[in-house]
């Protein structure tokens, strides 16, 4: 009995035409939503003039349906037992699951103004940029609609720059009609313990963003893992959103629609400083903002974002050091709401439910040559938004799963 089940599982989790895994892998049967909460700044003038604490109030959720598009350019390579693909990006607004419309306005950091002196550190250049910022009537903060903030708007300051640069700015710009990849993953045909593990991303085995082993692309994309998952295992996966590989550890056993699953959680030490977790030393790439690598809970992903001062954290700076959250008022980190977890069915290794939570922040620093920023007395890592991307196996699929997998084992 057990041998037969194991044999069936091994056959059905292979990523090739005709298997259960392949069908769900090409186009997920799960409806995936991405909820956004925007941090609306309540005291923009006070901050710009007096370098006060930034008072924020989160507004949301604003919900989009994502990951509804099938993988494309799927190519099997029988030589090395891999399958390559790209994942198209798309987002559809869901008004019924949102607190308002895409036209709702928010006061947020001016992304272009904040980034300019970070990207252009030369003082001559900053003088030129300052004149363009003033000419465009831009300031430290701006009011933007949800749609503009997420998906892009023509920036008035950048529109005055005489160089052929992109003048469109948005937290996720460009998104619709773009693809993530190329991913090349092992199909498991020769070795089931490697199924879905990423062999390369964008044609490379390393990211070129981090020094040393931090730069490695480890594990799967978290949608599934090699079968027969044990509680003692550390699940490693790569997330292009945060430009790094990360890991999850066993948290608890739960029942998901009658299916026993293991809940794997991202541990706090994944975001720890090198002082607390020496393994993280290569994720600390600069010494000033990180207070000589003693700060924790934020990840500088600028190298992955064309040098823009983008920092990723958990929502509300959960698991972040006090120095990071001290200049911001209105944050209420909460483990249940703000942590990331994966509910993995241990026999197949399929992720049947997940919640990916992360926050996008922008660093803004005092800049003597930029009038909009010259009154700042300290750097701020400014929260822009946080997101909760969730997916749960549908009732019908769950029944089918129980019949075909867990039911047979019982």
């Amino acid at each position: 009995g057990d041998m037969l089940i194991e044999k069936t599982i091994k056959r059905e989790v292979v990523l090739e035409e005709g298997t259960t895994a392949f069908k769900n892998w090409v186009k997920t049967g799960t409806t995936v939503y991405r909820q956004f909460w925007i941090f609306d700044v309540q005291n923009p003038d006070d901050v710009a003039k007096n370098s006060s604490k930034i008072k924020v109030k989160q507004r949301g959720p604003y919900t989009y349906r994502v990951r509804y598009l099938a993988k494309e350019n799927i190519t099997q390579d029988p030589e090395d037992h891999t399958v390559s693909f790209v994942q198209p990006n798309g987002a559809i607004f869901e008004p019924s699951l949102s607190v308002g419309t895409e036209d709702d306005n928010f006061t947020v950091l001016n992304l272009a103004v904040a980034a300019a002196p970070h990207i252009y550190q030369n003082s001559f250049v900053q003088v030129v940029l300052n004149s363009l910022i003033k000419k465009s009537k831009s300031s430290m903060f701006q009011t933007r609609s949800l749609k503009e903030l997420l998906w892009g708007y023509k920036d008035p300051f950048l529109s005055l720059v005489p160089y052929p640069i992109s003048t469109t700015v948005g937290v996720f710009y460009p998104y619709n009609d773009t693809v993530d990849g190329v991913y090349k993953v092992f199909n498991g045909k020769d070795n089931i313990s490697k199924v879905a593990i990423i062999e390369s991303y964008k044609g490379k085995r390393n990211l070129s963003y981090w020094p040393s082993y931090c730069d490695m692309i480890n594990g799967t994309d978290a949608a599934s893992f090699p079968p027969f998952v044990e509680k003692s295992r550390t699940l490693r996966f790569f997330s292009s959103d945060i430009c790094r590989s990360i890991y999850a550890v066993f948290g608890s056993e739960i029942d998901l629609k009658g299916i026993p699953v293991y809940r794997f959680v991202l541990p706090a030490n994944a975001f720890a400083s090198p002082l607390q977790n020496p393994d993280n030393h290569c994720f600390c790439t600069e010494k000033v903002i990180s207070n000589n690598c003693t700060s924790y809970g934020v990840l500088d992903i600028g190298k992955c974002k064309e040098g823009k001062p983008v920092y990723i954290s958990l929502p509300h700076f959960l698991h972040a050091s006090p120095d990071v959250s001290e200049p911001i008022e209105g944050l209420h980190p909460n483990e249940d709401e703000h942590r990331t977890y994966l509910d993995v069915e241990p026999i197949t290794g399929f992720t049947l439910q997940f919640a990916k939570r992360l926050q996008v922040n922008i660093l803004v620093k005092p800049a003597r040559k930029i009038e909009a920023l010259k009154n700042l007395k300290r750097p701020y890592i400014v929260p822009i938004l946080w997101l909760n991307e969730t997916g749960t196996i549908g009732d019908e699929k769950a029944e089918m799963f129980k019949t075909q997998v867990t039911g047979k084992i019982k």
């Epitope: 990207i119 252009y120 030369n122 940029l129 000419k135 005489p162 160089y163 052929p164 040098g307």
Partner: antibody
């Protein structure tokens, strides 16, 4: 003082590729755009494109987009231009030139690299 | 593309004379940010071009004050008040207001 030292003359066959280098010294390499300019024999100058070493951002003259690829190696303060699918039309002197600080002028130029494409 | 037309093609002068080179663009060089990115370069025989004037009328550091630039919109002029031997070469105007940035065809300043 600012200096841009370009690689030596190149003689290549049609259809081949070539990579020209420009080593910068005397300033912070990552702070300034680096431009490339073409001068065909006895002719005027043509702007090819630029690269910003800080983040590798590029801007191209559309005419050269499929001909030239601009890259940098910040560790050695060197800018590179690769020219591909070479024809006799690509025979020229190629200059690297430093941006003067965001006012679209070139304040320092390399000595030029002569490229000859001939079978 | 913006076409930059320089006149004359060749300018024979005597040392000590005044020289004037004209540059006309096929469209206005006033950028949407209000600046006019019209610059002048000199290329001496066997050398790389050198910047003389930037943004119509600003002399680059080390450039003698006998060089001056003027103009607006589509019409620009470079003047050399008293030509010296070291001024001989080809003068190019350049526009950086519209991508792709373009150079004029050049004006050769030579001894009469």
């Amino acid at each position: 003082d600012v200096q841009l030292q370009e690689s030596g003359p190149e003689l290549v066959k049609p259809g081949a590729s070539v990579k020209i280098s420009c080593k910068a010294s005397g300033y912070t390499f990552t702070d300034y755009n680096m431009h490339w300019v073409k001068q065909s024999h006895g002719k005027s100058l043509e702007w090819i494109g630029y690269i910003y070493p800080y983040n590798g951002g590029t801007g191209y003259n559309q005419k050269f987009k499929s001909k030239a690829t601009l890259t940098v190696d910040n560790s050695s303060s060197t800018a590179y231009m690769e020219l591909r699918s070479l024809t006799s039309e690509d025979s020229a002197v190629y200059y690297c030139a430093r941006d003067g600080g965001y006012d679209v002028y070139f304040d320092y130029w390399g000595q030029g690299t002569t490229l000859t494409v001939s079978s | 593309d913006v076409v930059m037309t320089q006149t004359p093609l060749s300018l024979p002068v005597s040392l000590g004379d005044q020289a004037s080179i004209s540059c006309r663009s096929s469209q206005s060089l006033v950028h949407s940010n209000g600046n006019t990115y019209l610059h002048w370069y000199l290329q001496k025989p066997g050398q790389s071009p050198k910047l003389l004037i930037y943004k119509v009328s600003n002399r680059f550091s080390g450039v003698p004050d006998r060089f001056s630039g003027s103009g607006s919109g589509t019409d620009f002029t470079l003047k050399i008040s008293r030509v010296e031997a070291e001024d001989l070469g080809v003068y190019y105007c350049f526009q950086g207001s519209h991508v792709p940035w373009t150079f004029g065809g050049g004006t050769k300043l030579e001894i009469k």
